[in-house]
Interface confidence: medium
């Protein structure tokens, strides 16, 4: 990589974007945002996968972690020929799928939406569009949207989580590249250490979780520290402090020496996980330490 | 809607004891950090202490080893068991609703510490 | 432990704007919540997060957070208004939750 910014985070990322005939000449733009966007996701826990829509929705490459068939899903990617109607609404359907069946499978990966268009939506197909994407946050997805050229931002406002999740593109196709370290910043959450990592068996203990994008949360109130303890029992505690890159949360009092605490966050009240491979052991402690 | 009604206020005499409970409603009890924040008359909030949902404990220093904050979630009702009581912790003791901020509120209880 | 300096008082005119400041020197680090106190009554939370306002509080009432300051503004501030009004942040090397001194906001007239 060019060793610009990356993202560690653990979720499930869906790139929706617009293949409609008004794109045709911009495809290439569009294909090289997604693909230098995609290769600063780097955690081996993020899984991604690629919709287009016109006048239908297509999944061309499913959710997948394995970096070889993302590889391919980009070259399935470049080869896409634009044409049809903007039919948002049916991209999203595509992502809520994949994003229903990961949850009936027991997966509780938090859901992060990356929708690009560059047109405005006409009535009906703005009304479908803002239904399909409140119907994939229900499902617990957080929703971007990237506007270029000719598009309405007040819709992708309402179609997005709010308006500091809209990205617009005002100078056409070629700007596409200037916003990726901005997009990337915004739609990265990530845990990336816990301190201490080491607690004291039987005690009360806070941890300071530190990471990114804990703000980018719809509502603040509703994230939530995990602790995965023992790979089996998981314990969910409200932070007292959520700022963007650190959570301040209590710890569980972990009984015995050698127990271990998987910390994985929530944005959404529990409904889906952010995972990372960070891990709280805990230790003897001794009076005086 | 959430209710937090605090009671075992009262008159005690330096060095005494006295337990506060605060009953709570309207919300799932065990899901929620709780805290104790306190008003001297006259005075401004003072946090004294915070419980959280599973149960790890936090206590201001001026309360340090003197107050045991608890809860049972069976009975959704927090406590603050106070020990050697002194002058200075004459207040108006609120329960609330807690985590990084204090959402609700209980109308308070008076404790009042003189010989 | 952050300390956070609020003025005693504040007094302004009904239907004008009155902005109370919090300042300490970790505010840049940390979110701020206000609360509002009426005599004899129990706080209210009126803003969290620096700028979040809770569900039936009057939009009126906004909050920000820049450099060693954080805000509470009142638009159009009513007689009803008048409390004390307190800055609340914390620590992020422990949980200790912090109240300024408070503020006693007048409405004139």
């Known amino acids: 990589e060019d060793g610009g910014p990356a993202c560690y985070g653990g979720f499930d990322l869906y790139f929706i974007l617009d293949k409609s005939g008004s794109v045709l000449h911009h495809w290439n733009e569009i294909y090289y945002f997604v693909e230098q966007l995609a290769h600063r996701f780097i955690s081996p826990q993020l899984r991604m996968s690629f919709i287009v829509f016109s006048t239908r929705g297509t999944t061309l490459m499913k959710l997948t972690e394995d970096r070889e068939q993302i590889r391919q899903g980009l070259e399935e990617l470049q080869k896409v020929l634009p044409g049809g109607d903007t039919y948002m609404h049916e991209g999203f359907e595509r992502a809520s799928e994949q994003i229903y069946y990961e949850n009936s499978q027991g997966y509780r990966t938090a859901s992060v939406i990356i929708a690009l268009t560059d047109g405005e939506l006409h009535e009906d197909l703005f009304f479908y569009s803002e239904r399909e994407a409140n119907r994939s946050r229900d499902l617990g997805a957080i929703v971007y949207c990237v506007g270029v050229k000719d598009f309405n931002e007040t819709q992708l406002a309402r179609i997005a989580d709010s308006k500091d999740h809209v990205f617009p593109v005002n100078d056409g196709f070629q700007a596409l590249q200037g916003i990726i370290h901005s997009i990337l910043k915004k739609s990265c959450i990530e845990i990336l250490a816990a301190e201490p990592s080491t607690i004291c068996a039987g005690e009360s203990f806070q941890v300071v979780v530190r990471g990114n994008g804990f703000r980018h949360a719809r509502n603040v109130d509703r994230v939530l520290c995990s602790f995965k303890i023992n790979d089996s029992v998981t314990l969910n505690e409200k932070p007292f402090a959520v700022e963007d890159t650190y959570l301040l949360c209590p710890a569980p009092i972990l009984k015995e020496v050698g127990m271990k605490a998987a910390l994985q966050v929530s944005m959404n009240d529990g409904l889906s996980f952010i995972s990372s491979s960070v891990i709280i052991t805990t230790t003897h402690c001794s009076d005086g330490s | 809607q959430v209710q937090l009604v605090e009671s075992g206020g009262g008159l005690v005499q330096p060095g005494g004891s006295l337990r506060l409970s605060c009953a709570a409603s309207?919300?799932?009890?065990?899901?929620?950090?709780m805290s104790w924040v306190r008003q001297a008359p006259g005075k401004g909030l003072e946090w004294v202490s915070l419980i959280s949902s599973g149960s790890s404990t936090y206590y201001a220093d001026s309360v340090k080893g003197r107050f045991t904050i608890s809860r049972d979630n069976s009975k959704n009702t927090l406590y603050l068991q106070m020990n050697s009581l002194r002058a200075e912790d004459t207040a108006v003791y609120y329960c609330a609703r807690a985590g990084f901020k204090f959402d609700n509120w209980g109308q308070g209880t008076l404790v009042t510490v003189s010989s | 432990d952050i300390e956070l300096t609020q003025p005693p008082s504040v007094s302004v005119a009904p239907g004008q704007t009155a902005r109370i400041s919090c300042s300490g020197d970790?505010?840049?680090?940390?979110?701020v919540s206000w609360y509002q106190q009426k005599p004899g009554q129990a706080p209210v939370l009126v803003i969290y997060a620096d700028s979040n306002r809770p569900s039936g509080i009057p939009e009126r009432f906004s909050g920000s957070n820049s450099g060693n300051t954080a805000t509470l503004t009142i638009s159009g501030t009513q007689a009803e208004d008048e409390a004390d009004y307190y800055c609340q942040s914390y620590d992020n090397t422990s949980p200790d939750l912090v109240f300024g001194g408070g503020t006693k906001l007048t409405v004139l007239g």
């Open positions: 970790s505010i840049p680090n940390y979110s």
């Open positions: 309207g919300f799932t009890f065990n899901s929620y950090a």
